[in-house]
């Protein structure tokens, strides 16, 4: 069904990092255009990118309502010039997407170390504390106001001179770690939500070592 | 667990009007879309109306359009079904059901039963 | 308004045959169409929705199928509380519609 020379949209899919989250469809119009329209399971349908040429749709500002909730996205496909016409059934042609739930399946970004520095033998690493665009009275949230306590951090470092690596975590931004005296060492971490069955971990984060290690212990 | 239980039902003559509840537990229900679904004695089922979480989006099927209308009241967890100018035809079973994006229906009342009859 | 037709309208099995009912559409409705079971005097319960998506709680000897006019609904084998009666329903657009049913007995 549907009208002439409009054809559904197909391969609805998801694209979100840290609540950014973008729907992203095909095939590229020809002599169509598209509108979006995003709900949770209240049925109550928002219309978003009304009548674009575009082949994708940010939806943050949508979903960061409440990103526990699961939303259902729907893609509608109307003739180019002629956006009152419908189907054969008096009705535009659509496509839902999958579901989606965004604290189940944004991917994490990669993380950030902010920061090493040494007390005595110890480092502490310090992981940049990522500001989402999930506000709350009025203010943005950060990943771990968002998270909370699922979110766990990786530490992985190792002597520059052996490839032995070691493995530290967290759920907070900070570790403090054993280090030998005199030696250097790299660090790269890693985001992990052990509550979610997949899609649980970040990209590794750009890994950072320390230089000239002697004068940062003082000698 | 899911529970959702009609009233309201019973025996009413041709022209008459009756007041279905649906009271909601065991999830947050201004979540959800709700709906009606009917099943006349010894028929199939038969989508009746539909309602989206805020209450702002309804739909009816053309038998029933300007004679009942569905509503809710989320601070009561509560669906109703008015139906005015009743017939014949609409002694059925009425079942409320919750009803994710307004689709599919996951779960169901136990229905109750209207009769319409002189 | 879409036309949703069963086949069979009833069928007779034995416990553990593999069982087929389809339903079709008068025109396309993608995936959107779901499946109940309903027992006699009893409220129908989800067993299907988007077609293949089984319903949280049903067991996996059921199974849905199809996309577009034709879908079919598999019990992978049959087990005496499966003998009720099963409806198909689009959800593509309203009024949204149902299948008359196919009554499954036992054979």
């Known amino acids: 069904s549907g009208t002439t020379n409009t054809v559904a949209a197909y391969n609805l899919t998801w694209k979100s990092t840290n609540f950014k989250t973008i729907l992203e469809w095909e095939p590229k119009p020809v002599n169509q255009v598209y509108t979006v329209q995003i709900s949770t399971k209240s049925g109550d349908w928002k219309s978003k990118c009304f009548y674009t040429t575009d082949t994708e749709c940010d939806l943050t500002d949508e979903i960061v309502k409440d990103v526990k909730q699961t939303y259902l996205a729907r893609v509608f496909s109307y003739p180019a010039g002629n956006v009152e016409s419908t189907g054969s059934a008096g009705e535009p042609l659509y496509e839902n997407s999958p579901e989606f739930t965004p604290y189940l399946e944004t991917n994490l970004g990669q993380p950030t170390i902010q920061s090493f520095e040494q007390v005595g033998t110890k480092v502490n690493v310090t992981v940049e504390d990522e500001r989402t665009l999930v506000r709350r009275n009025n203010t943005f949230l950060s990943l771990r106001d968002v998270f909370g306590k699922d979110l766990i951090y990786t530490l992985y470092y190792w002597k520059s001179s052996s490839s032995g690596k070691k493995t530290a975590k967290t759920n907070t931004n900070e570790f403090l770690i054993d280090v030998d005296k005199g030696e250097n060492y790299c660090f790269s971490v890693q985001a992990v939500i052990f509550s979610r069955k997949t899609n649980h971990k970040s990209p590794e984060s750009i890994t950072k070592c320390t230089e000239q290690w002697k004068s940062v212990l003082g000698e | 667990e899911v529970q959702l239980l009609e009233s309201g039902g019973g025996l009413v003559q041709p022209g008459g009007s009756l007041r279905l509840s649906c009271a909601a537990s065991g999830f947050t229900f201004s979540n959800y879309a709700m709906s009606w679904v009917r099943q006349a004695p010894g028929k199939g089922l038969e989508w009746v109306s539909s309602i989206s979480g805020s209450g702002d989006y309804t739909y009816y099927t053309d038998s029933v359009k300007g004679r009942f209308t569905i509503s809710r009241d989320n601070s009561k967890n509560t669906l109703y079904l008015q139906m005015n100018s009743l017939r014949a035809e609409d002694t059925a079973v009425y079942y409320c059901?919750?009803?994710?994006?307004?689709?599919?229906?996951?779960?169901w009342g136990q229905g109750t039963l209207v009769t319409v009859s002189s | 308004d879409i036309q949703m037709t069963q086949s069979p309208p009833s069928l007779s099995a034995s416990a553990g045959d593999r069982v087929t009912i389809t339903c079709r559409a008068s025109q396309g409705i993608s995936s959107r169409l779901a499946w109940y079971q309903q027992k006699p005097e009893k409220a129908p319960k989800s067993l299907i929705y988007a077609a293949s998506s089984l319903q949280s709680g049903v067991p996996s000897r059921f199974s849905g199928s199809g996309s577009g006019t034709d879908f079919t609904l598999t019990i992978s084998s049959l087990q005496p509380e499966d003998f009720a009666t099963y409806y198909c329903?689009?959800?593509?657009?309203?009024?949204?519609?149902f299948g008359q049913g196919t009554k499954l007995e036992i054979k």
């Open positions: 059901a919750r009803s994710p994006w307004g689709y599919y229906l996951d779960s």
């Open positions: 329903q689009q959800y593509n657009s309203y009024p949204y519609t």
